[in-house]
């Protein structure tokens, strides 16, 4: 099944995808699409690159903010809404016969939660999930670097939520 990534409504979502250009600088076409990777290309394309640069974006909210020329084609979706939830396909279209690399990732967009944990738990939360659970006061997570995001799945989030609840923290869905 797909790796899941979580973002709050109004924040930026980061969906990692990368390849190693061989030789360095020898870029290949990449597409990002909403929906699992089909047999060919991407379905419902949101962003596409050619051998040089991004040449197609369906919205100004979709960006490649990593080092595209080194093969970091991670997708940033700005100001996410609940409608952005779902599976996304990153397809690296390596030339040749049936050489594509396909990566399906799942974005889970959650409503902002008001968390008022004990101070120690607040510190633990921030250090354990520096970019995953952000509140409006921190602003969009635009400064994240590839690889800095922990691979947090829903199970981990639910476990964290239960720990907060057990500690007496109040959690309210906005």
């Amino acid at each position: 099944s797909e790796v899941e990534y979580i973002a709050e409504v109004g924040q930026n979502a980061y969906l990692p995808c990368s390849y190693t250009p061989a030789p360095p600088g020898n870029l290949v076409p990449v597409c990002w699409g909403k929906g699992a990777c089909p047999v060919f290309d991407c379905s419902n394309v949101v962003l596409r690159t050619d051998n040089r640069d991004v040449n197609d974006r369906t919205s100004g909210r979709y960006w490649l903010k990593g080092d595209f020329h080194k093969g970091d084609v991670s997708l940033t979706i700005e100001n996410v809404t609940l409608a952005d939830s779902g599976v996304y396909c990153c397809r690296i279209q390596i030339p040749g016969i049936m050489n594509d690399e396909k990566h399906n990732v799942k974005l889970v967009v959650i409503k902002p939660a008001k968390v008022t944990p004990a101070p120690t738990l607040q510190r633990d939360l921030t250090s354990a999930f520096p970019r995953m659970l952000t509140t409006g006061e921190h602003g969009p997570a635009e400064t994240q670097t590839p690889g800095s995001l922990p691979d947090v799945n829903l199970t981990q989030i639910f476990t964290l939520t239960n720990e907060l609840r057990d500690s007496g923290a109040t959690i309210r869905t906005a």
């Epitope: 089909p38 047999v39 060919f40 290309d41 379905s43 030339p95 040749g96 594509d100």
Partner: antibody, heavy 116, light 108 residues
Framework: EVQLLESGGGLVQPGGSLRLSCAAS????????MHWVRQAPGKGLEWVSA????????YYADSVKGRFTISRDNSKNTLYLQMNSLRAEDTAVYYC?????????WGQGTLVTVSS | EIVLTQSPGTLSLSPGERATLSCRAS???????LAWYQQKPGQAPRLLIY???SRATGIPDRFSGSGSGTDFTLTISRLEPEDFAVYYC?????????FGQGTKVEIK
């Protein structure tokens, strides 16, 4: 109006070769994936091969891999299928079709008969 | 590969009747990546439905598609004389592209 016109079919002996062409018009050829699909007499449809916009990526059914080669010339708006080491079971009408994963326009097909 | 099994093999109906064609996949078709085509004798196939339920350009609204997972249906709400043909389903969720064996809709 989108038009796809296949040519190059005919009678060929087992082990022989044939090159099919598909002339496209009415759309921006270089902006679309293209496919070959075949249909044996009285049978159903079988996907054969596909090629990406630029021609840099190609895909084949296991039944033709290593024997058939798909290519395109975007300057001539033409799709090709080079068929080598032909077998009796390759006998079919060969259609070229436009589209990525679903095929929204098809040519009328060209008949390839492999027989001694 | 995903095997698509269409049923019935032949459907004998009269003009004006409702036709229900089934396409069952050997494993789940991701994201409802399924298309339907119509083929008349001596003609090329014609795309009717993609994405399991989206009608292709120019297709009359008497044609509708539904389903997800492994079970998909093409419905022709009221058969017109020109609808008697062979219908194929095709999946594009898993390599390679595969087609069903077809359902023939014939005049009763």
């Amino acid at each position: 109006e989108v038009q796809l016109l296949e040519s190059g079919g005919g009678l060929v002996q087992p082990g022989g070769s044939l090159r099919l062409s598909c002339a496209a018009s009415g759309f921006t050829f270089s902006g679309y994936w293209m496919h070959w699909v075949r249909q044996a007499p009285g049978k159903g449809l079988e996907w054969v091969s596909a090629i990406s916009y630029s021609g840099s990526s190609t895909y084949y059914a296991d039944s033709v891999k290593g024997r058939f080669t798909i290519s395109r010339d975007n300057s001539k708006n033409t799709l090709y299928l080079q068929m080598n080491s032909l077998r009796a079971e390759d006998t079919a009408v060969y259609y070229c079709a436009k589209g990525t994963n679903w095929l929204d326009y098809w040519g009328q097909g060209t008949l390839v008969t492999v027989s001694s | 590969e995903i095997v698509l099994t269409q049923s019935p093999g032949t459907l004998s109906l009269s003009p004006g009747e409702r036709a229900t064609l089934s396409c069952r996949a050997s494993q789940s078709v991701s994201s409802s990546y399924l298309a339907w085509y119509q083929q008349k004798p001596g003609q090329a196939p014609r795309l009717l439905i993609y994405g399991a339920s989206s009608r292709a350009t120019g297709i009359p609204d008497r044609f509708s598609g539904s389903g997800s997972g492994t079970d998909f249906t093409l419905t022709i709400s009221r058969l017109e004389p020109e609808d008697f043909a062979v219908y194929y389903c095709q999946q594009y969720g898993s390599s390679p592209l595969t087609f069903g064996q077809g359902t023939k809709v014939e005049i009763k």
